[in-house]
C-alpha cells in the first residue's frame, strides 16, 4: 500500500545526462544540447549519395543497449558509438565507417541501401 501523499503514478527517471545533438535535436533542445536518462551517441553513416554524414544526440535508456550495439545492416555503411561518462561526452566519440565491400569497385548487381532519413538530404 502507498503511504499517504505518495503518488501512484509511475515516476519518470530523471534526465541527468546532457549530450551534444546535431540533426537529432528534440524541439525543446537549447544550443544543440539534449538531455537523457540513457546515453549520448555519435553516428557516422553514408547518406543516400554516399557522403559520410555525422549526426549526434541522445538515446533514452529504453532500447539504447540494442541501438548502441551497432549490429551491421546489409548494404548500409554506418557506425554508432555511445557514452555516458560525462555531459557532452559524445563530442569526443569518433565512430568510423566499416570498409567498402569489393563489389563496389566492379560492375555488378546494384545494391540499394535503406536509410532512416534525417532532416537533411544530400
Amino acid at each position: 500500500k502507498k503511504e499517504d501523499g505518495e503518488s501512484t503514478a509511475p515516476t519518470a527517471r530523471p534526465k541527468v545526462l546532457r549530450c551534444k545533438c546535431h540533426h537529432h535535436c528534440p524541439e525543446d533542445s537549447v544550443n544543440n544540447i539534449c538531455s537523457t536518462d540513457g546515453y549520448c551517441f555519435t553516428m557516422i553513416e553514408e547518406d543516400d549519395s554516399g557522403t559520410p554524414v555525422v549526426t549526434s544526440g541522445c538515446l533514452g535508456l529504453e532500447g539504447s543497449d540494442f541501438q548502441c550495439r551497432d549490429t551491421p545492416i546489409p548494404h548500409q555503411r554506418r557506425s554508432i558509438e555511445c557514452c555516458t561518462e560525462r555531459n557532452e561526452c559524445n563530442k569526443d566519440l569518433h565512430p568510423t565507417l566499416p570498409p567498402l565491400k569489393d563489389r563496389d569497385f566492379v560492375d555488378g548487381p546494384i545494391h540499394h541501401k535503406h536509410h532512416h532519413h534525417h532532416h537533411h538530404h544530400h
Partner: antibody
C-alpha cells in the same frame, strides 16, 4: 583504381552551349553520385549540382539551375553537364567529382573558354 | 546559403613548421566538413571528411578538428610538397559551399 576522365579543354562562342563529359572507371558507376564543381581563377570553388547515376535524380545549386543540365549515360559510365547561353562569366575549369564514404575522387577538369 | 569563411587568404610557413588553417561556417554544420588540398594545375584532393577523419593515404601530419561553426586543418612538420591551396567545404545542407581558400607559401 577509381578514375574520372574529362576532356582537357573546350573553346565555345558566346551564346552557344557546350556539353562536358566525365567518364568513370574502376567502380560501379551507379553506386556513386556525381557532383559538378566550377572553379574560376581567384574565385574559389562553386558547387553546381549532383546527379544520382542510378535514378537520374538531380539536385542543383539555385544559382546554376538555368545554366546547367546534368545527365548520365549508364552504358558508357559517363556523366555529362550541358552549359547553355554561355558568357565570359562561364569561362572556368569544370570538375566532376564522385564520392562514396571514405573515397573521394575528382576528375582532371575541363577548361571552358568562352570567346568570339 | 551557408557561408564558409577562410579569413586568411595567404599563410607563410617554413619546412618543419606547424601551421593551422581555419574556416568558419555562418551557421552550425555539426562536423559535416571536408578539407581539400589543391596544387597549381591539379584537381582538388580530399584530405579530411567529417571534420576530423583522414582519408586513406593522407599523411598523419594533416589533422582536422572542430565542430559547429569553427574548423581547423593543422599541418604539423610542414613539407615542401604541402605548399598548396587549402579549401574547406560544408556538406551539412544544400547548396554545398566552399571556403575561398588559403594559400600556403614558403616564408
Amino acid at each position: 583504381q577509381v578514375q574520372l576522365q574529362q576532356p582537357g579543354a573546350e573553346l565555345v562562342k558566346p551564346g552557344a552551349s557546350v556539353k562536358l563529359s566525365c567518364k568513370a572507371s574502376g567502380y560501379t558507376f551507379t553506386t556513386y553520385w556525381m557532383h559538378w564543381v566550377k572553379q574560376r581563377p581567384g574565385r574559389g570553388l562553386e558547387w553546381i549540382g549532383r546527379i544520382d547515376p542510378n535514378s537520374g535524380g538531380t539536385k542543383y545549386n539555385e544559382k546554376f539551375k538555368s545554366k546547367a543540365t546534368l545527365t548520365v549515360d549508364k552504358p558508357s559510365s559517363t556523366a555529362c553537364m550541358q552549359l547553355s547561353s554561355l558568357t565570359s562569366e562561364d569561362s572556368a575549369v569544370y570538375y566532376c567529382a564522385s564520392r562514396r564514404g571514405d573515397i573521394d575522387v575528382w576528375g582532371t577538369g575541363t577548361t571552358v573558354t568562352v570567346s568570339s | 546559403d551557408i557561408v564558409m569563411t577562410q579569413s586568411q587568404k595567404f599563410m607563410s610557413t617554413s619546412v618543419g613548421d606547424r601551421v593551422s588553417v581555419t574556416c568558419k561556417a555562418s551557421q552550425n554544420v555539426g562536423t559535416n566538413v571536408f578539407w581539400y588540398q589543391q596544387k597549381p594545375g591539379q584537381s582538388p584532393k580530399a584530405l579530411i571528411y567529417a571534420a576530423s577523419y583522414r582519408y586513406s593515404g593522407v599523411p598523419d601530419r594533416f589533422t582536422g578538428s572542430g565542430s559547429g561553426t569553427d574548423f581547423t586543418l593543422t599541418i604539423s612538420n610542414v613539407q615542401s610538397e604541402d605548399l598548396a591551396d587549402y579549401f574547406c567545404q560544408q556538406y551539412d545542407s544544400y547548396p554545398l559551399t566552399f571556403g575561398d581558400g588559403t594559400k600556403l607559401e614558403l616564408r
